[in-house]
């Protein structure tokens, strides 16, 4: 018996087609993805093949103006239109709190939304009961397939799930649910979830009874053969894991932003064992036409967005590199721009002894969600900035000891190379890392811009001195593992909305050209 699994993950509000780097579509003939194009391909496969499931592994929420304006209603509407069979909850589904998940999505979705390792407690338990499930058994042709969901247990550090949801260890929570499916004589089981590729592989290895793992969160691109676009494969598709009980378990992910449709064919024997698995992500490029009915619906929903944010704020004459590949690994000019805007927004010349009360900015690279292409006449709109900074956060002022900042910069690179969001972009700081040293001892130079000076210059950080720093509220609250900031900050003052800070700066500057200028170095 053959099953076709179509899958998406980390779509992040890319309902419309995008450019190749998943920013706003500029040249339509070269654009990719979007739900109208996705629907065309899904329907084509549904017509051609008998047993098809369309699954999403989470993080539909957050990423463009669509989410800023519609707050999840757009996700429910278009996923219903595409007839998704199931979705796992991702961490970003909690960005607007639990209410922002329940009302627009959980109550409106016509497909099951899954997570076995999220347990509700307190008054929320009865409110959310039945709106998401640990698993669902789906009839497919003459067979049934069990889908069991999971969500990153790091979600409380990454989003806003509140205090009444407990995120359990994925493997511990999944095993009894898979065992339950086995008692129902469900012998074909897919783990669908949002914890990243490393956890996906662990689930494949450790959870007895899981036949296939469909993942998300780490934006992992897998491909067998010559990849069709810019993404470099992290391994073959599917990635085969040998389970502890000796089975070959295919693990898949489909990059992100709706650029690809994951396509996996699985052959099962009569006992539900995987005999073979093969496939590849399908690049949703312009050779696949956009479905006219979905496109018309998109255009109808688009009207509200156009009114919202299409005015030009200013211009860039350089590419604003906000890609994960840059901002999570090295200094990126988008990070420099944002930090410069953050400092600029806090210029307060209140004392002749100080040119300003604050000179430093830190910004988690994972908070930069999109680049901006200068080839669209250089125009920058609120909409462009909403894709870069989609989380609706604030840029806050804190006071920290030098020792806390040192810990923060060690945390920035403690697991460098895994494309994790804690890598810090900076302003008013020069940092040098030596990655050959062990984690916790990799910062070899940390100089900070003086404030009590007429000519600003960089001086070594003093461990016992108290510094003012501008940073996202996400970091002030200990997000991305920066617990030391939350625990050790001496003062915390709420600031202005992130997009507003950057848009005001761009409007003030009129033309911008941020450079990569040696703020972050590796020895």
């Amino acid at each position: 018996w053959e099953l076709t699994i179509l899958h998406t993950n980390d779509v992040h509000s890319r309902l419309e087609q995008t450019s190749e780097d998943s920013s706003k579509c500029v040249n339509a003939s070269r654009c990719m993805g979007g739900v109208a194009r996705l629907f065309t391909k899904v329907q084509q496969i549904r017509r051609a093949e008998p047993n098809v499931l369309l699954l999403d592994a989470g993080d539909q929420y957050q990423g463009t103006i669509w989410f800023t304006v519609y707050k999840g209603a757009e996700v429910a509407h278009f996923m219903n239109a595409l007839r998704y069979d199931a979705m796992a909850l991702g961490n970003h589904e909690f960005d607007n709190g639990v209410e922002g998940l329940i009302e627009p999505l959980l109550k409106e979705a016509k497909f099951p939304i899954l997570s076995a390792n999220i347990k509700a407690k307190g008054p929320l338990a009865s409110q959310i009961s039945g709106l998401y499930l640990p698993y669902k058994v789906l009839p497919v042709g003459d067979e049934v397939v069990g889908i069991v969901g999971y969500t990153s247990k790091e979600t409380p550090f990454l989003s806003n799930p509140g205090t009444n949801l407990v995120f359990e260890d994925e493997i511990t929570a999944l095993q009894p649910e898979v065992d339950k499916l086995k008692t129902l004589n469900v012998n074909k089981i897919i783990a669908l979830g949002h914890s990243g590729f490393e956890m996906d592989k662990l689930i494949a290895q450790k959870v007895r009874g899981v036949d296939v793992v469909v993942g998300g969160h780490s934006n992992t691109f897998l491909y067998t053969g010559n990849p069709p676009s810019k993404e470099v494969p992290a391994g073959k598709y599917p990635f085969i894991v040998t389970s502890d009980d000796g089975r070959k378990v295919p693990v898949v992910q489909a990059y992100a932003f709706g650029k690809y449709l994951g396509y996996l064919k699985i052959e099962f024997d009569e006992r539900g064992n995987v005999i073979s698995s093969h496939g590849n992500p399908i690049l949703l490029n312009s050779s696949i036409p956009e479905d006219p009915s979905i496109k018309a619906d998109i255009n109808k929903w688009r009207i509200k967005l156009d009114n919202y944010s299409t005015q030009e704020l200013g211009k860039t004459i350089v590419y604003l590199d906000g890609s994960s590949q840059s901002c999570r690994f090295r200094e990126c000019n988008m990070g420099n721009l944002i930090c410069d805007a953050m400092i600029n927004n806090n210029l307060r010349h209140t004392d002749e002894m100080f040119w300003n009360h604050v000179s430093m900015c830190i910004l988690n690279g994972g908070g930069i969600r999109s680049p901006i292409d200068e080839r669209n006449n250089g125009t920058i709109t609120w909409e462009n900035l909403a894709a870069v900074l989609p989380f609706g956060g604030t840029f806050d002022l804190v006071q920290l000891k030098g020792s806390t900042l040192k810990k923060a910069f060690e945390h920035s690179v403690h697991r460098y190379g895994q494309s994790t969001g804690e890598f810090l972009q900076v302003g008013g700081i020069h940092v040098v890392y030596d990655l050959s040293r062990k984690p916790g001892d990799r910062v070899v130079k940390l100089d900070v811009l003086c404030t009590k000076c007429r000519v600003p210059s960089y001086d070594p950080l003093k461990m016992d001195e108290v510094y003012k720093v501008i940073l996202p509220n996400f970091l002030a609250n200990g997000g991305d593992g920066f617990q030391m900031i939350k625990d050790e900050l001496l003062r915390h003052d709420s600031g202005d909305q992130d997009i507003n800070v950057v848009s005001t700066y761009i409007s003030k500057m009129k033309v911008i050209y941020p450079a990569v200028e040696g703020r972050i170095k590796f020895s």
């Epitope: 009865s126 698993y135 009839p139 049934v144 649910e177 339950k180 469900v186």
Partner: antibody, heavy 119, light 107 residues
């Protein structure tokens, strides 16, 4: 609205068989399990087994395996439960009930069929 | 098989009383618990599933709680139509099993 209508009462002799029917309407027949639950006079509820009309898959309570047969006729949206080698302790009201494939609580029940086993 | 032990087996109460029925599973059932109400000569009626989820049309005076092996059905203010027998049922492990029932009678 969802309805499960069962066949009428039966009187059987020990050693005989009985076949009870359950006709479903008001929902998509092939997407829910039909379960059989019995209740002896003055006693509690006992689950016997279930059939999934979508693919004919059956799960049994081991206590009844070999004596109970469940079949489905999708053309008439009817499920049948046959219990063989009847004995006096099989005297009970037999209910069919609808349940999700994956979460087997029973949201709709038939009216019940009394089966009396007596010599 | 998972044994479901209900207590008490019967109780007498008056209209307006708060009534609590408990159900103990012989092993963990991961919140896969339903409660039914049955009146003489009638089929059981689903009240709650998943421990706390109220079936459509069931009055809000019925509520459920519990986790692991211990579960409770509470009727916050007993009404004349609530005098009946109540059963719990686990649907974690086949065979699905019911508690022995609790008969709620008029005092």
């Amino acid at each position: 609205q969802v309805q499960l209508v069962q066949s009428g009462a039966e009187v059987k002799k020990p050693g005989a068989s009985v076949k009870v029917s359950c006709k479903a309407s008001g929902y998509t027949f092939t997407t829910y399990n039909i379960h059989w639950v019995r209740q002896a006079p003055g006693q509690g509820l006992e689950w016997m087994g279930a059939i999934f009309p979508g693919n004919g898959h059956i799960s049994y309570n081991q206590k009844f395996k070999g004596r109970v047969t469940m079949t489905v006729d999708t053309s008439t949206s009817t499920v049948y439960m046959e219990l063989s080698s009847l004995r006096s302790e099989d005297t009970a009201v037999y209910y069919c009930a609808r349940g999700d494939y994956d979460e087997s609580y029973f949201d709709y029940w038939g009216q019940g069929t009394l089966v009396t086993v007596s010599s | 098989d998972i044994q479901m032990t209900q207590s008490p087996s019967s109780l007498s109460a008056s209209v307006g009383d708060r009534v609590t029925i408990t159900c103990k599973a012989s092993e963990g059932i991961y919140n896969r618990l339903a409660w039914y109400q049955q009146k003489p000569g009638k089929a059981p009626k689903l009240l709650l599933y998943g421990v706390i989820s109220l079936e459509t049309g069931v009055p809000s005076r019925f509520s459920g709680s519990g986790s692991g092996t211990d579960y409770t059905l509470t009727i916050s203010s007993l009404q004349p139509e609530d005098f009946a027998t109540y059963y719990c049922q686990q649907y974690w492990s086949i065979p699905w099993t019911f508690g022995g029932g609790t008969k709620v009678e008029i005092k």
